[in-house]
């Protein structure tokens, strides 16, 4: 039960995280005009990964895409790449994790397969979250550097554009969305990996027990009910587990080929 809950929660947390990463990547407010000296501005500038926007006091907003690819800073390209890799890995991870969910039965998929899929998706979520956090952090670092550079009168805009003296950029909402989303995806991935441990069917090791039946000795071998002596009902044969907290029902309840959900 705890395993199912951990896996389900991990999936939901990762789903929210990946949705956040997608949202952050699409958002225009990665960097916003610094309003420290002038809280009310006639022209408000903000920039995203794909375009830069200007909002005038009339409410009119004009956005222009970065139509050049070669003219963009390498760091911006790197951030774009990290975010896209994060989204792709996260999307694949979600797809894999759907089939790995314990509450969903697909054909005669064994727990070992589900455990492997859970681990795979968990790792994908962790890498996805790390990509997003790295991307956002690289952009934030770039902003901090540019902020102080612009103060020193060295202006380089996001799209290779020359900035005017007044415009300095600070952290936009997308950075915080990205950090939180990346963190959630990472946590979701860790939860999936934890759930995987509980899902993995462990080797059922039995203590070697000697039985002195009249006439001959039979050593009971590990391997569940597969070790048979050819005698009638072994009323005294008790399975002694080294580990594992599952009931006998759980061990034996494999879905039939007609058991689809």
């Amino acid at each position: 039960m705890a395993v199912t809950a951990c896996q389900g929660l991990g999936f939901v947390v990762s789903l929210i995280g990946i949705a956040g990463i997608i949202a952050a990547t699409c958002m225009d407010q990665w960097s916003t005009q610094d309003l420290y000296n002038n809280p009310v501005t006639a022209v408000f500038n903000y920039q995203g990964l794909w375009r830069s926007c200007v909002r005038e006091s009339s409410g009119f907003t004009e956005c222009r895409g970065y139509f050049t690819l070669l003219g963009l800073p390498a760091m911006l390209q790197a951030v774009r790449a990290l975010m896209i890799v994060g989204i792709v890995l996260g999307a694949i991870g979600l797809l894999v994790s759907i089939f790995a969910l314990k509450c969903i039965r697909i054909g005669s998929m064994e727990d070992s397969a589900k455990a492997n899929m859970t681990l795979t998706s968990g790792i994908m979520f962790i890498v996805s979250g790390l990509c997003a956090i790295a991307g956002v952090s690289v952009f934030a670092n770039m902003l901090v550097t540019n902020f102080w550079m612009s103060t020193a009168n060295m202006y380089t805009g996001m799209g290779g554009m020359v900035q005017t003296v007044q415009t300095r950029y600070t952290f936009g909402a997308a950075l915080f969305v990205g950090w939180v989303a990346g963190g959630l995806t990472l946590i979701g991935g860790v939860m999936m990996c934890i759930a995987c441990r509980g899902l993995a069917p462990e080797e059922t090791n039995y203590k070697a027990v000697s039985y002195h039946a009249s006439g001959h000795s039979v050593a009971y071998k590990p391997g569940g009910f597969k070790a048979s002596t050819g005698f009638g009902s072994n009323t005294k044969n008790k399975k002694i587990y080294d580990g594992g907290a599952r009931t006998e029902d759980e061990v034996q309840s494999y879905p039939s080929k007609h058991d689809y959900v």
Partner: antibody
């Protein structure tokens, strides 16, 4: 067509207050910011401030912060500017003007202006 | 505050003449985000409110004759009237609409010779 109607003139005593009106018609009043501009006789233009009619949010020129108070009445599509503690320096023509949408922060329509004379 | 300086303060011209007036700002009016210059030109005739001629430094307002041309970028701007007509005699103001408070130049008065 867009129209901004202002009373022609106001005569007020020094130290008194006056409330100037600007009735808008021909467009959706709440969609456009309203600006107020001062012009002293034979002199240039001075921006007083602006008000967003949809939420009443104002932005003033620091110079006029203690002098002017901008308000709106959405029901009558009217913008108001109250000028307080009037002195001879406040004798001027006051214009209300609609901020254009997509024109930067230029104003495309102006009222005819209200001439305020401060005299005892 | 951004200070707008217009020159000359007055101009005496004959009908049909080409006229150029200047406007300089104490800070750049070029916005980095859209590479647009936030400067407007107004024409004011005696006893009338100002009329918008040019916005964005070079875009003519609808209905404004094409003899009026705005140019310039950053801190230096120019209004040119290619062939002055009698109805063009007025005071011309430039306005900073990039930063608050919005500021106007002192004006250039166009007079008939």
């Amino acid at each position: 067509q867009v129209q901004l109607q202002q009373p022609g003139a106001e005569l007020v005593k020094p130290g008194a207050s006056v409330k100037l009106s600007c009735k808008a018609s021909g467009y959706t009043f709440t969609r456009y910011l309203m600006h107020w501009v001062k012009q002293r006789p034979g002199q240039g233009l001075e921006w007083i401030g602006e008000i967003n009619p949809s939420n009443g949010r104002t932005n003033y020129n620091e110079k006029f912060k203690s002098k002017a108070a901008l308000t709106v009445d959405k029901s009558s599509s009217t913008a108001y500017m109250q000028l307080s503690s009037l002195t001879s320096e406040d004798s001027a023509v006051y214009y209300c003007a609609r901020l254009a949408y997509g024109y930067g922060n230029a104003v495309d329509y102006w009222g005819q202006g209200t001439s305020v004379t401060v005299s005892s | 505050d951004i200070v707008m300086t217009q020159s000359p303060s007055s101009l005496s011209v004959s009908a049909g003449e080409k006229v150029t007036m200047s406007c300089k700002s104490s800070q750049s009016l070029l916005n980095s985000g859209n590479q647009k210059n936030y400067l407007a030109w107004y024409q004011q005739k005696p006893g009338q409110p100002p009329k918008l001629l040019i916005y964005g430094a070079s875009t003519r307002e609808s209905g404004v004759p094409d003899r009026f041309t705005g140019s310039g970028s950053g801190t230096d701007f120019t209004l040119t009237i290619s062939s002055v007509q009698a109805e063009d005699l007025a005071v011309y103001y430039c306005q900073n609409d990039h930063s608050y408070p919005l500021t106007f130049g002192a004006g250039t008065k166009l007079e008939l010779k």
